[in-house]
Amino acid sequence: YDFTNCDFEKIKAAYLSTISKDLITYMSGTKSTEFNNTVSCSNRPHCLTEIQSLTFNPTAGCASLAKEMFAMKTKAALAIWCPGYSETQINATQAMKKRRKRKVTTNKCLEQVSQLQGLWRRFNRPLLKQQ
């Protein structure tokens, strides 16, 4: 999906009002400098691409993020403020339902959410251009 035509300010508002708190709640108990920041993004569409990937694509050691509160709110924000996004996700959602597993917070998931916090932080930068 190409995130170029999203309403970035509305997504930013959704992040600031709820998603950020949910990320903080998920990370509760984690040490500040426990994880190195290794994932980056250069503009807002790129940031959303990376955020989508880390939030919804299962990775080795962390298959469970898509059912977390921050993930569901991220999905809702993208569906509302990115034209055509929800249509592209129908197949992915159905595939995810088949894979549904017990929620387990692994260290790998915490590391991934730490990276997500960094990506959202970059997305929110006031001078970060759309292109």
Epitope: S20, M27, K31, S32, N37, S114, R125
Partner: antibody, heavy 118, light 107 residues
Framework: QVQLVQSGAEVKKPGASVKVSCKAS????????MHWVRQAPGQGLEWIGE????????DYNQNFRGRATMTVDMSTSTVYMELSSLRSEDTAVYYC???????????WGQGTLVTVSS | DIQMTQSPSFLSASVGDRVTITCKAS??????VAWYQQKPGKAPKLLIY???MRHTGVPSRFSGSGSGTEFTLTISSLQPEDFATYFC?????????FGQGTKLEIK
């Protein structure tokens, strides 16, 4: 182990600028954010702003926007904080402090006293 | 900005006493609160993070609790080295803010 070593005390006149340094060691410099916090004599702690050494992006407390400037020297793993248009109420100890993406401060520099006096 | 209101500002106590310091946030900060100890002429030292997690090396007599808007730091049995100034800090949202401090003095 993580170490943050700051420059020495400064005495400045009102209207002047001061540049305080914070040399970091013991970790991957670009992996974490560096913040500056100040404390006026007998007062509480006030967050000034932060810099991401990986790309020099800065974010400031609104109270300091336009007066505080944070920069990075990658070659020496040093962060600088310059404060301009100094006034007497800027007399304080200035600390650098390190965080990851979670913003509480588990590592601090030793502090730099900046005195603004005519 | 979220305001952190700390009380009391001053506290006199004796060695062996149990003391409690309170911090109230002007809005919900989940559990994103840290507590610091500061001695004269020194940088603050992290004691507690995530409202209740003790930092490495912090004695077990220090404990934190709370969530949402009300947080407490408790020292179960004061030791001579605990007389210092204590600050709370919220890191739930930008700008990061501190309480005004509680100076703990020997009675």
């Amino acid at each position: 182990q993580v170490q943050l070593v700051q420059s020495g005390a400064e005495v400045k006149k009102p209207g002047a600028s001061v540049k305080v340094s914070c040399k970091a060691s013991g970790y991957t410099f670009t992996s974490y954010l560096m913040h500056w916090v100040r404390q006026a004599p007998g007062q509480g702690l006030e967050w000034i702003g932060e810099i991401d050494p990986s790309d020099s992006y800065t974010d400031y407390n609104q109270n300091f926007r336009g007066r505080a400037t944070m920069t990075v020297d990658m070659s020496t793993s040093t962060v600088y904080m310059e404060l301009s248009s100094l006034r007497s109420e800027d007399t304080a100890v200035y600390y650098c402090a390190l965080t990851g993406t979670i913003n509480y401060f588990d590592y601090w520099g030793q502090g730099t006293l900046v005195t603004v006096s005519s | 900005d979220i305001q952190m209101t700390q009380s009391p500002s001053f506290l006199s106590a004796s060695v062996g006493d149990r003391v409690t310091i309170t911090c109230k946030a002007s809005q919900d900060v989940v559990t994103a609160v840290a507590w610091y100890q500061q001695k004269p002429g020194k940088a603050p030292k992290l004691l507690i993070y995530w409202a209740s997690m003790r930092h490495t090396g912090v004695p077990s007599r220090f404990s934190g609790s709370g969530s949402g808007t009300e947080f407490t730091l408790t020292i179960s049995s004061l030791q001579p080295e605990d007389f210092a100034t204590y600050f709370c800090q919220q890191y739930s949202s930008f700008t990061f803010t501190f309480g005004q401090g509680t100076k703990l003095e020997i009675k």
